[in-house]
Interface confidence: low
Amino acid sequence: EKSDYGNLTLAEDTNIGSTILTIQATDADEPFTGSSKILYHIIKGDSEGRLGVDTDPHTNTGYVIIKKPLDFETAAVSNIVFKAENPEPLVFGVKYNASSFAKFTLIVTDVNEAPQFSQHVFQAKVSEDVAIGTKVGNVTAKDPEGLDISYSLRGDTRGWLKIDHVTGEIFSVAPLDREAGSPYRVQVVATEVGGSSLSSVSEFHLILMDVNDNPPRLAKDYTGLFFCHPLSAPGSLIFEATDDDQHLFRGPHFTFSLGSGSLQNDWEVSKINGTHARLSTRHTEFEEREYVVLIRINDGGRPPLEGIVSLPVTFCSCVEGSCFRPAGHQTGIPTVGM
């Protein structure tokens, strides 16, 4: 019925699914048959497939709808041509003529859009002992309107990082610590400079690689160790060591030794495996009192770190396998017998 629907001006943020134009064609063939049914196709001016045409089969009305977001930056003006045709082929010798084609001009107006990050999540990996001021990563975003972007960090709860507002480079500004939690997650904000100051948010994940910075220690509280006095035979006890470093490919391999030479007459320590060792008495002639045995534990790391731990061992007279003391004689009675 109409071959030129003129200009249609829309904002680039017009909702997907919106009907933007109604078109009407007529067919002289018998109603409600394949011969009179009309289908509409956009044949020119929409290579991105942003538009589509739905047809009402009862009225042959066509509804031009938005299928994909419009974009001022890539297509501000589009000359759209569509064709009305029957689903059944025309009889031999009959051709579609100019009245079967129509057009309209789609003018898209600019809407200020937020900057767009090149990734949803940016990841970087550094050793936890990097020098303060080291560049640990960078992020990039672009503004659809070409405005300058200012970067900032959000959620840097440990105060470890700084971002260069212009380049998006991220630097360490404090000592990093893998044991405090890795990866360390912060948000990166890209904000337009000027305009309406729209912003977008992405994630920056800093994976901290472990360095050997935690000395070995006892895996648990070993207070309350005791032997029944007098010893009838040399005794022993087992203890476990640990540290807070990451052991990715194998468990820790600690070595154990007595922490002072003077202990060697009374005690010996022998390794059971990488984490456990046995402390044994060398004789049975111990006084009825508490002995504090110092153990040196080396983690064999790079650099090797050493911890000196103390195991308090009490020799006490026992009743039915438990330490016995007259009331008031000793507080903190040990509870673990050997």
Epitope: T157, G159, K162, P175
Partner: antibody, heavy 118, light 107 residues
């Protein structure tokens, strides 16, 4: 030699805005990693960190005072400024500026005394 | 906020003494602790950073130790110029916070 010197009004009245200036020498606030903080100390009491400005103009504030504080800098004149709005007698204190580098306040100014009194 | 507590507000010691000033944090601070000295005239100086590192120009009689939440500053051989108030300060989390101070006096 790094030095910092604070200056302020000395005395002002409640509800007024306190403006402080920190003038420094021996370093540049355009150097990566540099920053200057403001710290205050009410008479006979402990130290309270107020605000910090980084070399790239990024800022950090103590949340308990954030709504009243504005820190800024003039890199070319080697100065850092602090404004505190709506002052009260509780804001009477000695105000220090200090250079913060590598997570430490390694050099401090001598402080400037501020009294809020009606 | 992380609270820094110096339980001893004042301390009296004799010249030559070994003095230890303690400081505790309300939560673990990963050794992110500095110590400052404030002289009676108000002058403030950095002594120790990162728990145990001696700042340049500070006499070796000052030392720091600790981990987790409990830290201490030790002066091994007290001298007259050490009369001051000593503050610990954490930088594990913002806001940066100081202890209440320990005033050191001569007996």
């Amino acid at each position: 030699q790094v030095t910092l010197k604070e200056s302020g009004p000395g005395i002002l009245q409640p509800s007024q805005t306190l403006s402080l200036t920190c003038s420094f020498s021996g370093f540049s606030l355009s150097t990566s990693g540099m920053g200057v903080s403001w710290i205050r100390q009410p008479s006979g009491k402990g130290l309270e960190w107020l605000a910090h400005i980084f070399w790239d103009d990024d800022k950090r504030y103590n949340p308990s005072l954030k709504s009243r504080l504005t820190i800024s800098k003039d890199t070319s004149r080697n100065q850092v400024f602090l404004k505190i709005t709506s002052v009260d007698t509780a804001d009477s204190a000695t105000y220090y500026c200090a250079r913060r580098v590598l997570s430490t306040f390694d050099v401090w100014g001598a402080g400037t005394s501020v009294t809020v009194s009606s | 906020d992380i609270q820094m507590t110096q339980t001893t507000s004042s301390l009296s010691a004799s010249l030559g003494d070994r003095v230890t000033i303690s400081c505790s944090a309300s939560q673990g601070i990963n050794n992110y602790l500095n110590w400052y000295q404030q002289k009676p005239d108000g002058t403030v100086k950095l002594l120790i950073y990162y728990t145990s590192s001696l700042h340049s120009g500070v006499p070796s009689r000052f030392s720091g130790s600790g981990s987790g939440t409990d830290f201490s500053l030790t002066i091994s051989n007290l001298e007259p110029e050490d009369i001051a108030t000593y503050y610990c300060q954490q930088y594990s989390k913002l806001p940066l916070t100081f202890g209440g101070g320990t005033k050191l006096e001569i007996k």
